[in-house]
Interface confidence: medium
């Protein structure tokens, strides 16, 4: 198919377009080119004969039109009104036609835009500023960028104007920066020169330095003051609300108690018209004054907040001191001092950190202390604790449970039964209870400074009966001669009777073996082996009676002095030498061999055929408890001699 | 020995009120929280809710609230349930039931005395 | 409100096989040593009966092929070796706040 493409499409001004032909037919008669969508002889730009190679303008025709063989049309010196359709007409030679339509686009090369403003020294928070990219150019795209990037996503920036003007609102000394519009069209793209916005702010509150306000008699006084500002600000400065010099410095050497005073320094902005002042009161000591403590938190919670406890008033080449509990400073991760001494920061403290706290400050003489400031922790509350321990209970009696948690302030207290709220107290009591009252009852305690929240769920069962008890251990793999065990006998239960027995006998009397806490805890104290036996621990009351299943004390011990057999000692030469060592232990030791200290293999049985004079020596087995980390060994002496030396001797194994 | 009887309509037509009765027997009900639970036709159960014979006290699965009401009858031994603006979708099998007759347990929601269901069915 | 979450939904298995259901609560239904997780068998037309009570206590009168275990969120139940008598639908409950039921699992022979 006959097609028209133009290159390029969009065209500048003065520049050329070629409107190059795909896919000519052949056996051409000759073609014609129009400017417009459709073949108008008034539109005519130039015809083609193939024959003769005769081209001939037509009446749209300027001049700046060259036809090629191929029937492409260069068109030169682009104007504005080229824009637009082009469509060639082709005759064959059987004088069929076909046409074509192509098109292009010409836009005017950009100039260099620039930016004009209707403030050039706007003042902060009151101005607002618009500037425009100029010259207002058709089918151009406007662009703007603040310090090389583009525009910041802001409330206060708009653009309007088909993104011509760009408005700042309530300009900021933020806002003090460069701006650059840009034009582009499809044919080129131009960047304005930077404009650099110089927004008048200030002053703000000065800021006096240094900050100390405590001053010794005989020492030199020099403030200096400095307040942003645009432009730069004029300063004054007032003693005691009298003039003294319009300058950011102000010196006063060797000062006494009279310069004791409240000092001004005034900050001027001649083009915003603003004033500011900043007063700081100066205090010169004749000697220096009694410490006092400033803190930046009163109530800091546990674990979350830092203290900050600065030891006032601030006195220059001063040495300061802290005193924690009437003792000098621990050595604490958590507790940092400032390079000067002054401020004792506390890190995530603690409810030991409380205090009290004292600071010093040591003159020539003598150390001045301040008053002991305590500090007021807040914290828990910790995991609430219900009380009484039972969880058993028999129907008609009370119930009165008591709930405690340690908190600052104190906590609050409310329960709840099985999940729904019952009353807001410290204590839960219930009348006769029956097996209705069965359930989970949780404490809630909380802390209404720190808004922490902590919970305790204990089971409650009414029962006539007694449930099957059962024995918890502290300690389920006890040492011999080292350890002790504590068995207890679970649940607690009120007006119940405990009682144990070992291989299904009562209690031996002994000093090794104690009961406790009414019965329900049994101890024994330097286990041995021989306690590893069966105990049950069994509950009563008026009403049934209940024993737990046995548990078997597992006594680690040992190992013992090992035993090496056969006891011989004497063995003829070809004989075979075959020795067990055994140690009681448990768990069952691990065994090794030696044979004149040179390590054998580690199995509790050593064998070596047939042997020989060679083969004397010492025979060390070495037993190891893992478990109770103990050792032990035995050696024995082992003599060969050659056959039929002496009678009397071992045949060996 | 131990058993509940639920009794009522077995057909409820959709906005009424549905209301069934339940008969222990072989024990006080004032010693235990009765229970209500349903279980439409081929699903799962649905606990509805507590009363606590003793003094009426109530408590209602959140999905119920506002349509259902126990109600108790010491001197008959029975409690009942009622579940009103009934549509299809309460059609189901409704059991009572108690927790921990024959078993020393520890919280009052536990199932082992149940009735043998009665079924309800909502349709006009 | 704890969701109560039962897998499978349905199961087949052999008889003597050993069969396994779990319940997921979404949060801990476990509470001062006791976790509230029961374990329920419902034979069709007829009321559930309690096998399991407080994760792994056996009911009176149930076969202790029948078993539970779990803590915190997590609960098992399991049939040591299966038997014709067991085809069911199996139901976990717990009983930390108001009760739930988990969805059901149905337990075919195979």
């Known amino acids: 198919k006959l097609t028209i493409e133009s290159t390029p499409f969009n065209v500048a001004e003065g520049k050329e377009v070629l409107l190059l032909v795909h896919n000519l037919p052949q056996h051409l008669f000759g073609y014609s080119w129009y400017k417009g969508e459709r073949v108008d002889g008034n539109r005519q730009i130039i015809g083609y004969v193939i024959g003769t190679q005769q081209a001939t303008p037509g009446p749209a025709y300027s001049g700046r039109e060259i036809i090629y063989p191929n029937a492409s049309l260069l068109i030169q010196n682009i104007i504005q009104n080229d824009t637009g359709f082009y469509t060639l007409h082709v005759i064959k030679s059987d004088l069929v036609n076909e046409e074509a339509t192509g098109q292009f686009r010409v836009y005017p090369e950009l100039p260099k835009p620039s930016i004009s403003s209707n403030n050039s020294k706007p003042v902060e928070d009151k101005d607002a500023v618009a500037f425009t990219c100029e010259p207002e150019t058709q089918d151009a795209t406007y662009l703007w960028w603040v310090n090389n990037q583009s525009l910041p996503v802001s409330p206060r920036l708009q653009l309007s104007n088909g993104n011509r003007t760009l408005t700042l609102f309530n300009v900021t000394r933020n806002d003090t920066a460069s701006y650059k519009c840009e034009t582009q069209n499809p044919v080129s793209a131009r960047r304005s020169d930077s404009v650099i916005l110089n927004v008048l702010y200030g002053p703000d509150a000065p800021t006096i330095s240094p900050l100390n306000t405590s001053y010794r008699s005989g020492e030199n006084l020099n403030l200096s003051c400095h307040a942003a500002s645009n432009p730069p600000a004029q300063y004054s400065w007032f003693v005691n609300g009298t003039f003294q010099q319009s300058t950011q410095e102000l010196f006063i050497p060797n000062i006494t108690v009279n310069n004791s005073g409240s000092y001004t320094c005034q900050a001027h902005n001649s083009d915003t018209g603003l004033n500011r002042t900043t007063v700081t009161t100066i205090t010169v000591y004749a000697e220096p004054p009694k410490p006092f403590i400033t803190s930046n938190n009163s109530n800091p919670v546990e674990d979350e907040d830092a203290v900050a406890l600065t030891c006032e008033p601030e006195i220059q080449n001063t040495t300061y001191l802290w005193w924690v509990n009437n003792q000098s400073l621990p050595v604490s991760p958590r507790l940092q001092l400032s390079n000067d001494n002054r401020t004792l920061t506390l890190l995530s403290v603690t409810r030991n950190d409380v205090g009290p706290y004292e600071c010093g400050i040591q003159n020539e003489l003598s150390v001045d202390h301040s008053d002991p400031v305590i500090l007021n922790v807040l914290y828990g509350p910790d995991d609430p604790t219900i009380s009484p321990s039972y969880t058993y209970y028999r129907p008609g009696v009370n119930l009165s449970l008591s709930c405690h948690a340690a908190s600052n302030p104190p906590a609050q207290y409310s329960w709840l039964i099985d999940g729904n709220i019952q009353q807001h107290t410290q204590e839960l009591f219930i009348s006769n209870i029956t097996e209705k009252n069965s359930g989970l009852y949780t404490c809630q305690a909380n802390n209404s400074a720190s808004g922490h929240s902590r919970t305790t769920v204990k089971t409650i069962t009414v029962s006539a009966e007694l449930p099957k008890p059962s024995i918890s251990s502290n300690n389920s793999k006890p040492v011999e001669d080292k350890d002790a065990v504590a068995f207890t006998c679970e649940p607690e239960a009120q007006n119940t009777t405990y009682l144990w027995w070992v291989n299904g006998q009562s209690l031996p009397v002994s000093p090794r073996l104690q009961l406790s806490n009414g019965n329900r805890t049994l101890t024994l104290f330097n286990v041995t082996r021989n306690d590893a036996r069966a105990y049950v621990c069994g509950i009563q009351n008026s009403v049934s009676a209940n024993r737990s299943d046995p548990v078997t004390l597992d006594v680690l011990y040992g190992p013992d002095t090992p035993i090496i057999s056969p006891p011989d000692s004497s063995y003829l030469s070809g004989a075979n030498l075959n020795l067990s060592c055994h140690s009681a232990s448990n768990p069952s030791p691990q065994y090794s061999w030696r044979i004149n200290g040179i390590p054998q293999q580690h199995t509790q049985v050593l064998f070596i055929a047939k042997i020989t004079p060679n083969n004397n020596g010492t025979y060390a087995c070495f037993v190891s408890n893992l478990a109770t980390g103990r050792n032990n060994s035995i050696v024995k002496s082992i003599t060969v001699s050659a056959s039929g030396t002496s009678p009397g001797l071992s045949a060996g194994a | 020995q131990v058993q509940l009887q639920e009794s009522g309509p077995g057909l409820v037509r959709p906005s009424q009120t549905l209301s069934l009765t339940c008969t222990a027997s072989?024990?006080?009900?004032?010693?235990?929280?009765m229970h209500w639970v349903r279980q439409p036709p081929g699903r799962g159960l649905e606990w509805i809710g507590w009363i606590d014979p003793e003094n009426g006290d109530t408590e209602y699965a959140p999905k119920f609230q506002g349509r259902v009401t126990m109600l108790v009858d010491t001197s008959k031994n029975t409690f009942s349930l009622r579940l009103s603006s009934v549509t299809a979708a309460d059609t189901a099998v409704y059991y009572c039931n108690t927790r921990g007759l024959s078993t020393m347990i520890t919280t009052r929601w536990f199932f082992d005395v149940w009735g043998q269901g009665s079924l309800v069915t909502v349709s006009s | 409100d704890i969701q109560m979450t039962q897998s499978p939904s349905s199961l087949s298995a052999s008889v003597g096989d050993r069969v396994t259901i779990t319940c997921r609560a979404s949060k801990s239904v476990s509470a001062s040593g006791y976790s509230y997780m029961h374990w329920y068998q419902q034979t069709p037309g007829k009321a559930p009966k309690l096998l399991i009570y407080l994760a792994s206590n056996l009911q009176s009168g149930v076969p202790s092929r029948f078993s539970g275990s779990g803590s915190g969120t997590d609960y098992t139940f399991t049939i040591s070796s299966l038997q014709p008598e067991d085809i069911a639908t199996y139901y976990c409950?717990?009983?930390?706040?108001?009760?739930?039921f988990g969805q059901g699992t149905k337990l075919q022979i195979t």
């Open positions: 409950q717990h009983s930390r706040e108001l009760p739930t």
């Open positions: 072989g024990f006080n009900i004032k010693d235990y929280y």
